[in-house]
Amino acid sequence: MMTGTIETTGNISAEKGGSIILQCHLSSTTAQVTQVNWEQQDQLLAICNADLGWHISPSFKDRVAPGPGLGLTLQSLTVNDTGEYFCIYHTYPDGTYTGRIFLEVLESSVAEHGARFQIP
């Protein structure tokens, strides 16, 4: 039975040209995390594998940095980066947990962080 929950940074905003950290945290489970995938819609941004370490997808390696922790840093943001981001935790024996973050990239300096929320 899957007992874990994923806490994410929720709905967040950031300025064009700036950077943002996407963070998820898996709690309430003793399952072993074997790999975390970071995806934007159906595009893979990066993975962090327990054995193999980090690997950034070729098309994002100039603008994506691993960490902190299992999080992901997006740099040189453009308005095209606005959208949904998913952290997908592959765990054993539980299976897959998915967290969602919505990022809005703003032209002006009114970027503010939204509230955290949980996805069971």
């Epitope: 990066a46 594998n49 193999l52 370490g53 690997h55 997808s57 070729p58 299976g95």
Partner: antibody
Framework: EVQLQQSGPELVKPGASVKMSCKAS????????MDWVKQSRGASFEWIGR????????SYNQKFKGKATLTVDKSSSTAYMELNSLTSEDSAVYYC????????????WGAGTTVTVSS | QIVLTQSPAIMSASPGEKVTMTCSAS?????MHWYQQKSGTSPKRWIY???KLASGVPTRFSGSGSGTSYSLTISSMEAEDAASYFC?????????FGAGTKLELK
């Protein structure tokens, strides 16, 4: 053209070791993972392990821990697999394959290296 | 580790016939991938992420499924489709293949 060029067939004696190579060309070697897969005669496939060429870190199928060792030479875009303490059970075709990062499938395969263990 | 059972093990089809082969997983998996292999050659990625066709694969092929049940379908069999087809999955602690379905031309 994206290619994985594997070393030639090997005939080895029981108890010996063998090291085979897989040279990548036509793509940036460090942008992908490299995997090794065993196909026994007339049988299906067994995944042996995966290598991250950026840092040399590896992930193995539990069954092949202690049997296979995966290494890399980034400068020549070449992955290697060494098999030790060979027995007749190790006679097979061994493929290197380019591994997808997230979904763990194999989009490019080498031609395979045939290993025959016989006294 | 997750066991993949392919059925049938061997099948034959006439040109123009619809072909369906299945891959059953012992536990739920998120994605299934399929490879085509012809005798004496290395496998080719055929269908990935359950339903996406690899580059160069004819559109008569399709893949579907979810959970523990997946399938590969050929809408109209052609001679060049005679080959062995293997399913493959990765879950958190294992990467496994099915034993294959050998498709012959009738």
């Amino acid at each position: 053209e994206v290619q994985l060029q594997q070393s030639g067939p090997e005939l080895v004696k029981p108890g010996a070791s063998v090291k085979m190579s897989c040279k990548a060309s036509g793509f940036t070697f460090t942008d992908y993972f490299m995997d090794w897969v065993k196909q026994s005669r007339g049988a299906s496939f067994e995944w042996i392990g995966r290598l991250n060429p950026n840092n040399g870190r590896t992930s193995y199928n539990q069954k092949f821990k202690g049997k296979a060792t995966l290494t890399v030479d980034k400068s020549s875009s070449t992955a290697y697999m060494e098999l030790n303490s060979l027995t007749s059970e190790d006679s097979a075709v061994y493929y290197c394959a380019r591994g997808d990062l997230g979904r763990w499938y194999f989009d490019v395969w080498g031609a395979g290296t045939t290993v025959t263990v016989s006294s | 580790q997750i066991v993949l059972t392919q059925s049938p093990a061997i099948m034959s089809a006439s040109p123009g016939e619809k072909v369906t082969m299945t891959c059953s997983a012992s536990s739920s998996v998120s994605y299934m991938h399929w490879y085509q292999q012809k005798s004496g050659t290395s496998p080719k990625r055929w269908i990935y992420d359950t339903s996406k066709l690899a580059s160069g694969v004819p559109t008569r092929f399709s893949g579907s499924g979810s959970g523990t049940s997946y399938s590969l379908t050929i809408s109209s069999m052609e001679a060049e489709d005679a080959a062995s087809y293997f399913c493959q999955q990765w879950s958190s602690n294992s990467l496994t293949f099915g034993a294959g379905t050998k498709l012959e031309l009738k």
